[in-house]
Amino acid sequence: MMTGTIETTGNISAEKGGSIILQCHLSSTTAQVTQVNWEQQDQLLAICNADLGWHISPSFKDRVAPGPGLGLTLQSLTVNDTGEYFCIYHTYPDGTYTGRIFLEVLE
């Protein structure tokens, strides 16, 4: 049974050219986090795997930094970065938890 909940930074805004931290936190469960995926619509941004560590997709490597923690830092923001971002927590034995963050990049 999945008892956990994902807390996120919710709806956030940032200035063009600036940076922002995308953060999710899994609480109310003792499940082990085995992997966290960060995605934007159908694009894979980054993965943090418990055994393999961090992987940033090549197309985002120059603008995305891992952390803090299981979060993700987006840098050199453009208006095209406006949209939905998702953290997907793969856990054992619970299964998968998903959090949503909406980012608005201001001119």
């Epitope: 159908d42 894979l44 993965i47 795997n49 393999l52 992987h55 998702f86 997907i88």
Partner: antibody, heavy 119, light 107 residues
């Protein structure tokens, strides 16, 4: 229970346009998934053709980009494939499948429909 | 496109045997590889995703491992119902691509 069901003509003449429809039950095509077409050639090779997301955005295999269109009818909870200028090389079993945008795998597939291109 | 090279193309085995199938990606896909089972006249069925994560309800005799470009799928003790064709697939980036398949036959 999520189910996908392909429907189409079975036989298409060369140079014509192939049209297939996938009817989805147990899951809304406007929920957080991408709705795919995948084909399997007689030699059993699988080829991903493209998808339409819950928001209506399409992504196609570049090898088919000039010939393929995927569209949807949300009122009927259906999505469709059109492939133009078909040849015998397009003879295959065509599957529709659900791809979890946030899960990154095909979790549900239709049973497949065999489409033959022949005059 | 990312090419998935799967081997062997077929193999003969007996019930109770351990079986290993390999898949090599033409470029780094981190751990974004899935494995499917297909029986004659049926559609493919998901077994493993993210290289090593068993899908819901999949028996634990099926396992996967690997990262980067080299991946392995193992059946620890083949059962009668496991004779089928197995495919690897990269779910790292579009176009999504599959291996050519490995047909598991009864010796």
């Amino acid at each position: 229970q999520v189910q996908l069901q392909e429907s189409g003509p079975g036989l298409v003449k060369p140079s014509q346009t192939l049209s297939l429809t996938c009817t989805v039950t147990g899951s809304s095509i406007t929920s957080d998934y991408a709705w795919n077409w995948i084909r399997q050639f007689p030699g059993k090779k699988l080829e991903w053709m493209g998808y339409i997301t819950y928001s209506g955005r399409t992504t196609y295999n570049p090898s088919l980009k000039s010939r393929i269109t995927i569209s949807r009818d949300t009122s009927k909870n259906q999505f469709s494939l059109k492939l133009s200028s078909v040849t015998a090389a397009d003879t295959a079993t065509y599957y529709c499948a659900r791809w979890g945008l946030l899960r990154r795998y095909f979790d549900y597939w239709g049973q497949g429909t065999l489409l033959t291109v022949s005059s | 496109d990312i090419v998935m090279t799967q081997s062997p193309s077929s193999m003969s085995t007996s019930v109770g045997d351990r079986v290993t199938i390999t898949c090599r990606a033409s470029q780094d896909v981190f751990n974004q590889v899935a494995w499917y089972q297909q029986k004659p006249g049926k559609s493919p069925k998901l077994l493993i995703y993210s290289a090593s994560f068993r899908y819901t309800g999949v028996p634990d005799r099926f396992s996967g491992s690997g990262s980067g470009t080299d991946f392995t799928f193992t059946i620890s003790s083949v059962q009668a119902e496991d004779f089928a064709t197995y495919y690897c697939q990269q779910h790292y980036s579009t176009p999504l691509t599959f291996g050519a398949g490995t047909k598991l036959e009864l010796k």
